[in-house]
């Protein structure tokens, strides 16, 4: 029986340090071994019939024990398949490793409304692009956490919102009096440093009552 | 035929770094990962980490970062094991081993005594 | 990370008899197991790999079966050169040693 196989099925790695991702296979008399990377809708060829292909052979090399690349970016991070078929026979195997290439975060960017209306949405964001794996986020309301739920603490319990720390929105629904204050928001993705917004006010004000 | 051989053993003192070698021979050095066992009297074999010769790409195991560094040359097909911050624990046999996927073959381990 | 319990950690049979080891992993490790011999003073020795593909050289009298977490060594006639720690690797996801088995000869 045939076996192709990995120890490591995920590998993660500083960005622009070296890296191997292993490929071990048994039972193949004229093994042809190729590697395909995946990441969201892109698909390409890595290593086609034991030899590198032309988009990726200044930078890694094929061994027979798996492919080596001399420094990893954050575009390296995803999927690679390996697999192994007979030269001219009909047996097949394959075996996934997963590339994580470590960004720490950089700076988020926050968007919030320096005043919003009482009892309306105010929806607050906070982002960054650089972190990998992707960064989660933490809110801080005059330098106190957020916690993921208001009514888990007294200081936020007059507070009605809902905060994603994945996608990094705070929403409040409806804003109330007690909302005003100071918003900034923590990135961290375990890796590196984590990284804090400016801080920026946000007034939550009466709504204007027409004559 | 495939050969690692280890450098002779060592005594240290505590807080003191070793260095131990493992020259191997009869196979292409840089086609395959060479990895770092220990075993510690009456303990079980406990892995420590690896190189990748090609590329002198590392991974080691949580237990040990920060302590060990594992480096090779490819000039002489020799892979070199640092432990730093030696402790009375880290008496030990250390063992190189090359990777296929588990390991396939052993050098004939290298004593580390840590003692005042 | 995954664990690898070995039981017994020593036993001691006659010549002859039909020894067997145990390793159980802490999870399921896709038959990725291999078993190693060692003598008192050598480096660990490759008897099996994958579950149970005997490495070249290594008398038939050892063999190895299992599935999923639980796996087992087996020497059906113990010789007087058997006398060995063995461990198992699981090599699935990383690589972690069982706590090994000391064979003697009653």
């Known amino acids: 029986s045939v076996t192709v196989h990995s120890s490591e099925p995920e590998v993660r790695i500083p960005e622009n340090n070296p890296v191997k991702l292993s490929c071990a296979y048994s039972g193949f008399s004229s093994p042809r071994v190729e590697w395909k990377f995946d990441q969201g809708d892109t698909t390409r060829l890595v290593c086609y019939n034991n030899k590198i292909t032309a988009s990726y052979e200044d930078r890694v090399t094929f061994l027979p024990t798996g492919i080596t690349f001399k420094s990893v970016t954050r575009e390296d991070t995803g999927t690679y398949t390996c697999m192994v078929s007979e030269e001219g026979g009909n047996s097949y195997g394959e075996v996934k490793v997963k590339l994580i290439v470590l960004v720490p975060p950089s700076k988020p960017t926050v968007n919030i409304p320096s005043s919003a209306t009482i009892g309306n949405r105010a929806v607050l964001t906070c982002s960054e692009q650089d972190g990998s794996p992707p960064s989660e986020y933490t809110w801080f309301k005059d330098g106190i956490v957020m916690p993921t739920n208001p009514k888990s603490t007294r200081a936020f319990s007059n507070s009605s919102y809902v905060l994603n720390p994945t996608t990094g929105e705070l929403v409040f629904d409806p804003l109330s009096a007690s909302d005003t204050g100071e918003y900034s928001c923590e990135a961290r993705n375990g890796y590196g440093t984590p990284m804090t917004s400016n801080a920026v006010r946000m007034e939550a004000v009466e709504r204007n009552v027409g004559v | 035929q495939v050969q690692l051989v280890q450098s002779g053993a060592e005594v240290k003192k505590p807080g003191a770094s070793v260095k131990v070698s493992c020259k191997a021979s009869?196979?292409?050095?840089?086609?395959?990962?060479m990895h770092w066992v220990r075993q510690a009297p009456g303990q079980r074999l406990e892995w420590m980490g690896y190189?990748?010769?090609?590329?002198?790409?590392?991974r080691y195991s949580q237990k040990f970062q920060g302590r060990v560094t594992i480096t090779a040359d490819t000039s002489t097909s020799t892979a070199y094991m640092e432990l730093s911050s030696l402790r009375s624990e880290d008496t030990a046999v250390y063992y190189c081993a090359r990777q296929t996927d588990y390991f396939d073959y052993w050098g004939q381990g290298t004593l580390v005594t840590v003692s005042s | 990370d995954i664990q690898m319990t070995q039981s017994p950690s020593s036993l001691s049979a006659s010549v002859g008899d039909r020894v067997t080891i145990t390793c159980q992993a802490s999870?399921?490790?896709?038959?990725?197991i291999a078993w190693y011999q060692q003598k008192p003073g050598k480096a660990p020795k490759l008897l099996i790999h994958y579950t149970s593909t005997l490495e070249t050289g290594v008398p038939s009298r050892f063999s190895g079966s299992g599935s999923g977490t639980d796996y087992t060594f087996t020497i059906s006639s113990l010789q007087p050169e058997d006398i060995a720690t063995y461990y198992c690797?699981?090599?699935?996801?990383?690589?972690?040693f069982g706590q090994g088995t000391k064979v003697e000869i009653k």
């Open positions: 999870q399921d490790i896709n038959n990725y």
């Open positions: 190189i990748d010769p090609y590329n002198g790409g590392t």
């Open positions: 690797l699981q090599y699935d996801n990383l690589w972690t």
């Open positions: 009869g196979y292409s050095f840089t086609d395959y990962s």
